[in-house]
Interface confidence: medium
């Protein structure tokens, strides 16, 4: 008997009220292997999920999260909301920004601090995990009629290298 | 200085078993980054074999490395491994230990920021 | 996880801009965590571009990435002697689990 239901191929169960006679499997269920007792109800893709790939008699339906949201954990198990400024996205998720480096997108990665002082200038207003610091003048401009706070310098691209 | 030196390639007879080293300096593993091995036959391309997480141990393969590849860490020794059994002639590549780069918080950001100049494994009778 | 990257070889010159695609099967995670690499012969990889359109460290401007989902391109506005090598994008996916995938590579040689 228990051959009859391993002939039993994807796609379908065996199905025991009918003598292990292989049977489709009903509607929103699968089944992935073949010589299965039972099908598995397919996965529901609501609320936060979205339908990637639609369920089969073969295969499990895959969700994806709607926009402002990204998977997390194995098949996309969860979806977090998209990281706010002052944070950068990771494999385990949205990570605040370390103290010297700054985030001022939804998305994309922290960046260090500018270094004012490479360009020979001062700090004017301190960096935030949101916002790069504003490099002013140098002490040394400091003299009548020398120029107001310049825009800070393009963000560099950041250190990732674990320490 | 940053580094990652791969160690233990050479001839090996098909079916028999290698393992490969990757000691890095200049950094230590307690992290939540990986660290993977890439493999790259004479004259194609690159291919992806798996990786480790440093911090929890956690694994992850090509669907064509599992079972006969294993991948294992020491972090005392700050040293990554590559376990190969079951080779065979296509086997033959350079293979590289490559860090996944690291986040600001120490997490892994998915693409590889520092690789090993490569071990050559020869697979033949 | 099929990454296609056209054309498979290139011929140039040095000043000329050079463009290479790289299409993925599937989107790789956030739409965006899709990598280039240089190799020359004998080396290993080299990180130019990361998420899709970020110029790694002491990369040259003339580099540049776009793209999202599951199609990218890597751009070099004006291709220098030193920049013949092959080039490879670089996926990474979660599905059952995290994956890594690199495209078929782009050989760009003197015209």
């Known amino acids: 008997l228990q051959d009859l239901c391993s002939n039993c191929p994807a796609g379908t169960f065996c199905d025991n009220n009918r003598s292990q006679i292989c049977s489709p499997c009903p509607p929103n269920s699968f089944s992935s292997a073949g010589g299965q007792r039972t099908c598995d109800i397919c996965r529901q893709c609501k609320g936060v999920f979205k339908t990637r790939k639609e369920c089969s008699s073969t295969s499990n339906a895959e969700c994806d999260c709607i926009s402002g949201y990204h998977c997390l954990g194995a098949e996309c198990s969860m979806c977090e909301q998209d990281c706010k400024q002052g944070q950068e996205l990771t494999k385990k998720g949205c990570k605040d920004c370390c103290f010297g480096t700054f985030n001022d997108q939804k998305r994309g990665i922290c960046r260090p601090w500018t270094n004012c002082s490479l360009d020979g200038k001062s700090v004017l207003v301190n960096g935030t995990k949101e916002r790069d610091v504003v490099c002013g003048p140098s002490p040394a401009d400091l003299s009548p009629g020398a120029s107001s706070a310049t825009p800070p310098a393009p963000a560099r691209e950041p250190g990732h290298s674990p320490q | 200085e940053v580094q990652l030196v791969e160690s233990g390639g050479g001839l090996v007879q098909p079916g028999g078993s290698l393992r490969l080293s990757c000691a890095a300096s200049?950094?230590?593993?307690?992290?939540?980054?990986?660290m993977c091995w890439v493999r790259q036959a004479p004259g194609k391309g690159l291919e992806w074999i798996g990786c480790?997480?440093?911090?929890?141990?956690?694994?992850y393969y090509a669907s064509w490395a599992k079972g006969r590849f294993t991948i294992s860490r020491d972090n005392s020794k700050n040293t990554v491994y590559l376990q190969m059994n079951s080779l065979r002639a296509e086997d033959t590549a350079v293979y590289y230990c490559?860090?996944?780069?690291?986040?600001?918080?120490?997490?892994?950001?998915?693409?590889?920021?520092?690789w090993g100049q490569g071990t050559l494994v020869t697979v033949s009778s | 996880i099929q990454m296609t990257q056209s054309p498979s070889s290139l011929s140039a010159s040095v000043g000329d801009r050079v463009t290479i695609t790289c299409q993925s099967s599937?989107?790789?995670?956030?739409?965006?965590?899709l990598a280039w690499y240089q190799q020359k012969p004998g080396k290993a990889p080299k990180l130019l571009i990361y998420?899709?359109?970020n110029l790694a460290s002491g990369v040259p401007s003339r580099f540049s990435g776009s793209g999202s989902g599951t199609d990218f391109t890597l751009t070099i506005s004006s291709l220098q002697p030193e920049d013949f090598a092959t080039y490879y994008c670089?996926?990474?996916?979660?599905?059952?689990?995290?994956?890594?995938?690199f495209g078929t590579g782009t050989k760009v040689t003197v015209l």
């Open positions: 599937q989107s790789v995670y956030d739409n965006n965590w």
């Open positions: 480790i997480d440093t911090g929890d141990g956690s694994t």
């Open positions: 200049g950094f230590s593993f307690n992290n939540d980054y990986d």
């Open positions: 670089q996926g990474t996916y979660l599905s059952s689990n995290w994956y890594w995938a």
């Open positions: 998420r899709a359109s």
């Open positions: 490559a860090r996944e780069a690291a986040s600001s918080s120490g997490y892994g950001m998915g693409y590889f920021d520092l």
